[in-house]
Interface confidence: low
């Protein structure tokens, strides 16, 4: 390897080795290697080897740092948002509103307009504006999957709060799925109160948080203003023309 | 600032500025700044500003990289493990075993022996060896909190698998809590099947995964070997003497 | 990514992770670490060319930012990106200890 | 941490994050970015002294590893640690676009 001067590979390695010498002692806060005078003869105890293996397995399983950024992630992402279908739309009649769940419908054609191909989507967030909350509440997010089944996505423990606050859920995988399925016109999320197995439907806690966009009784301008704050999907995607550029530069390599 | 040559702060700043020029254009895949000839007069459209603000809010809320490593994390961590109290112990009689939950007791005096002070603990993982699983199962982990209440900790969607596999849950906060409370002799975890609100206790899915250490009918040597693979807490902590060293060097500063 | 898969199988002159196995006994003259006997420490090496953004050569420049200067640094430098910890076994007196040392193994590098 | 809190309020000669506000119009001569008008890009600068771990001076050396050479690099370098993205608004023809640029703001640096 050469820059201005020729790099002496062996010298670099030796410096690295010397640095590691200091590093290990330093990490263990030892001024010198510990004496071996009292070490018992024979192999290491089984329990110690087992513990070492457990630790090593953990190392193998998880990297300390995030994955290196894929090439496409270097480039800027276009940001768009798709608002939830308004609650006065008749499609909401399909699901009987309950005290422990709220439903959110999204028009997949609007999503496709924003992100023409699933592969272009780099991140999708479901954003909800929660209003004041007097007590802690544990909520779960689901995606409508097939006829009447729901797929669990994630959960959130919401602390009491005097002021409105935006909640954000990563729903990239779900939106990518919706974009791939041309047939589905609507995508549906459900936000439910968390129910431990010991409780039945009758005993389930009520949904104590108010989500902006589901607040009833507003009329005219005020309804419009608040309607803009209804749940929405925040989308980050590679614009089509940039993706094509990426593709062609990849072919050129 | 000086290294071998005096570093010209202004030059570095200018180079950075020039680099940013290229970086932004490059990220947008533009060869030159876009023409402004067609930009309509007046302020930005409200919807665009709203979208910009949504994106900016996200930026403010979350850093792209993990927090810088605190000083103590630089130093080595001692690794120990504390095995779950064996299931034939009478303390398990306190909780009626159900088809949708399993309970795991840990002796807090053993934890204190391994980690004398809560502040020394840097990570605690609950490790479970799950055996073969034929269908997908969604499980939740709870911590026993007060008399008969359980605090939700986390959840995991387990994919079908033909081979045994170690599951790991980060329970650092819980173990730190147990270490601070001298009065509690036992710490308890509960692993339950996830129950949507629509299902009552009678309809809850059964626990379909087998966890090593709860398998009945083993005797003698085989039971002992399998007992070693029962759930355990893997602890990583700063040894007391190293912590004191850290403390004193902090005071010396 | 400038990781072990790419760098160990290429003759990349620019920034890359370079192979380095540390044998505790042979390289450091240590017998006190019982497990492991050594480890693949690796290290980062190689120039990260500073990319000039002169109007006359913008087209060439823009394509190179991603690899050589993604952070738009004034003086990009080849440094570790992904690091992994290393658990070791050693004795203190008669007592064996297992300890984990953070950020010991370089898995990939980057120009930063 | 070599972050903005520490570095901007100190006269640290070694590796630190340095203050740099980029005004798109004034610094880059650009009028095409409508929002924001500029941003705190910052940058990393300062030496990361290579620490020789000679037996003769271990006591001095060991305390310095953490700050100056935590990765035990043969040639430690001052580089960004925490980075944040930047959203911008600009036009393409008559159409306004909001885009987010990753890793644009340096929040802290490290010797790596």
């Amino acid at each position: 390897l050469s820059t201005c001067k020729t790099i002496d590979m062996e010298l670099v390695k030796r410096k690295r080795i010397e640095a590691i010498r200091g590093q290990i002692l330093s990490k263990l806060r030892l001024a010198s290697p510990p004496s071996q005078g009292e070490v018992p003869p024979g192999p290491l105890p089984e329990a110690v080897l087992a513990l070492y293996n457990s630790t090593r397995d953990r190392v193998a399983g998880e990297s300390a740092e995030p994955e290196p950024e894929p090439e496409a992630d270097y480039y800027a992402k276009e940001v768009t948002r798709v608002l939830m279908v308004e609650t006065h739309n008749e499609i909401y009649d399909k699901f009987k509103q309950s005290t422990h769940s709220i439903y959110m419908f999204f028009n997949t054609s609007e999503l496709r307009e924003a992100v023409p191909e699933p592969v272009l989507l780099s991140r999708a967030e479901l954003r909800l504006l929660r209003l004041k909350l007097k007590v802690e509440q544990h909520v779960e997010l689901y995606q409508k999957y097939s006829n009447n089944s729901w797929r669990y996505l994630s959960n959130r423990l919401l602390a009491p709060s005097d002021s409105p606050e935006w909640l954000s859920f990563d729903v990239t995988g779900v939106v990518r799925q919706w974009l791939s399925r041309g047939s589905e016109l609507l995508g549906v999320f459900k936000l439910s109160v968390h129910c431990p197995c010991e409780m039945g439907p009758g005993h389930a806690d009520e949904m104590r948080i108010s989500i902006e966009g589901f607040t009833t009784g507003r009329r005219g301008d005020l309804a419009t203003i608040h309607g803009m704050n209804r749940p929405f999907l925040l989308l980050m995607a590679t614009p089509l023309e940039r993706a094509q550029h990426l593709q062609s530069s990849r072919h050129r390599r | 600032l000086s290294t071998c040559k005096t570093i010209d702060m202004e030059l570095v700043k200018r180079k950075r500025i020039e680099a940013i020029r290229g970086q932004i254009l490059s990220k947008l895949r533009l060869a030159s700044p876009p023409s402004q000839g067609e930009v309509p007069p007046g302020p930005l459209p409200e919807a665009v500003l709203a979208l910009y603000n949504s994106t900016r809010d996200r930026v403010a809320g979350e850093s792209a990289e993990p927090e810088p490593e605190p000083e103590a994390d630089y130093y080595a961590k001692e690794v120990t493990r504390v095995l779950m109290v064996e299931t034939h112990n009478e303390i398990y009689d306190k909780f009626k075993q159900s088809t949708h939950s399993i309970y795991m007791f840990f002796n807090t005096s053993e934890l204190r022996e391994a980690v004398p002070e809560p502040v020394l603990l840097s990570r605690a993982e609950l490790r479970l060896l799950r055996l073969k699983l034929k269908v997908e199962q969604h499980v939740e982990l709870y911590q026993k909190y007060s008399n008969n209440s359980w605090r939700y900790l986390s959840n995991r969607l387990l994919a079908p698998s033909d081979s045994p596999e170690w599951l790991s849950f980060d329970v650092t906060g819980v173990v730190r809590q147990w270490l601070s409370r001298g009065s509690e002799l036992l710490g308890v975890f509960k692993l339950s099947v996830h129950c949507p609100c629509e299902m009552g206790p009678g309809h809850a899915d059964e626990m379909r995964i087998s966890i090593e250490g709860f398998t009945t009918g083993r005797r003698g040597d085989l039971a002992t070997i399998h007992g070693m693979n029962r759930p355990f807490l893997l602890l990583m902590a700063t040894p007391l003497e190293r912590a004191q060293h850290l403390q004193s060097s902090r005071h010396r500063r | 990514a400038l990781d072990t898969n790419y760098c160990f199988s290429s003759t990349e002159k620019n920034c890359c992770v370079r192979q380095l196995y540390i044998d505790f006994r042979k390289d450091l003259g240590w017998k006190w670490i019982h497990e492991p006997k050594g480890y693949h420490a690796n290290f980062c090496l190689g120039p990260c060319p500073y990319i000039w953004s002169l109007d006359t050569q913008y087209s060439k420049v823009l394509a190179l930012y991603n690899q050589h200067n993604p952070g738009a640094s004034a003086a990009p430098c080849c440094v570790p990106q992904a690091l992994e910890p290393l658990p070791i076994v050693y004795y203190v007196g008669r007592k064996p200890k297992v300890e984990q040392l953070s950020n010991m193994i370089v898995r990939s590098c980057k120009c930063s | 941490a070599l972050d903005t809190n520490y570095c901007f309020s100190s006269t640290e000669k070694n590796c630190c994050v340095r203050q740099l506000y980029i005004d798109f119009r004034k610094d880059l001569g650009w009028k095409w970015i409508h929002e924001p008008k500029g941003y705190h890009a910052n940058f990393c600068l300062g030496p990361c002294p290579y620490i020789w771990s000679l037996d003769t001076q271990y006591s001095k050396v060991l305390a310095l590893y953490n700050q100056h050479n935590p990765g035990a690099s043969a040639a430690p370098c001052c580089v960004p640690q925490a980075l944040e993205p930047l959203p911008i608004v600009y036009y393409v023809g008559r159409k306004p676009k909001v885009e987010q640029l990753s890793n644009m703001i340096v929040r802290s640096c490290k010797c790596s």
Partner: antibody, heavy 120, light 107 residues
């Protein structure tokens, strides 16, 4: 329109002191580094120093020839740049220009200049 | 300090001519080379910065080129208004330094 107007030049005896001013308008003064440059009669331009902008804490940098004798300061509320000159010598006789300095290493706008003569 | 040398101290040319003024740095200045025009009344204006980038309002008949240590300013189609002294300046390393100037006269 960017405008820089210097004032305060005149005749001073060797060893004396003088303060030059530069009134700035047409731009946000605090956003810019401001610089002083001089030109002795029939000679080249010489950079004397600059004072940094608000994000950079209004710190100063000087050339070796004037360091310790000349001081650059600014009144941001009035958008005025100053050059305080002490222990003046004959070789300090020149036309003094104030200039706006940018991060690109160049001076993009200059004043018309004010003349200093140091003579007994 | 970096020395900037303009070897030609004065230059005569005719209106409409194309002429080049050169400037040499005592070390590589990485394209941080700027050109200024000083009119006979003492007024100074920036013409070109960063070797080749034209400052706003400067006619396109002015152009700059060069790299490393050697740089030049070219004026094509010389006009009466261009009669002035031209200075180069390096912006690579403090202290900023100027060339001695090249005085342009009409034949």
């Amino acid at each position: 329109e960017v405008k820089l107007v210097e004032s305060g030049g005149g005749l001073v005896q060797p060893g004396g002191s003088l303060s030059l001013s530069c009134a700035a308008s047409g731009f946000t003064f605090t956003d810019y580094y401001m610089s002083w440059v001089r030109q002795p009669p029939g000679k080249a331009l010489e950079w004397l120093g600059f004072i940094r902008n608000k994000p950079n804490g209004y710190t100063t940098e000087y050339s070796a020839s004037v360091k310790g004798r000349f001081t650059i300061s600014r009144d941001n509320s009035q958008s005025i740049l100053y050059l305080q000159m002490n222990v003046l010598r004959a070789e300090d006789s020149a036309t003094y220009y104030c200039a706006r300095y940018t991060g690109g290493g160049y001076f993009d706008y200059w004043g018309q200049g004010t003349t200093l003569t140091v003579s007994s | 300090d970096i020395q900037m040398t303009q070897t030609t101290s004065s230059l005569s040319a005719s209106l409409g001519d194309r002429l080049t003024i050169s400037c040499r740095a005592s070390q590589d200045i990485s394209n941080y080379l700027n050109w200024y025009q000083q009119k006979p009344d003492g007024t100074v204006k920036l013409l070109i910065y960063y070797t080749s980038r034209l400052h706003s309002g400067v006619p396109s008949r002015f152009s700059g080129s060069g790299s490393g240590t050697d740089y030049s300013l070219t004026i094509s189609n010389l006009e009466q208004a261009d009669i002035a002294t031209y200075f180069c300046q390096q912006g690579d390393t403090l202290p900023w330094t100027f060339g001695g100037g090249t005085k342009l006269e009409i034949k």
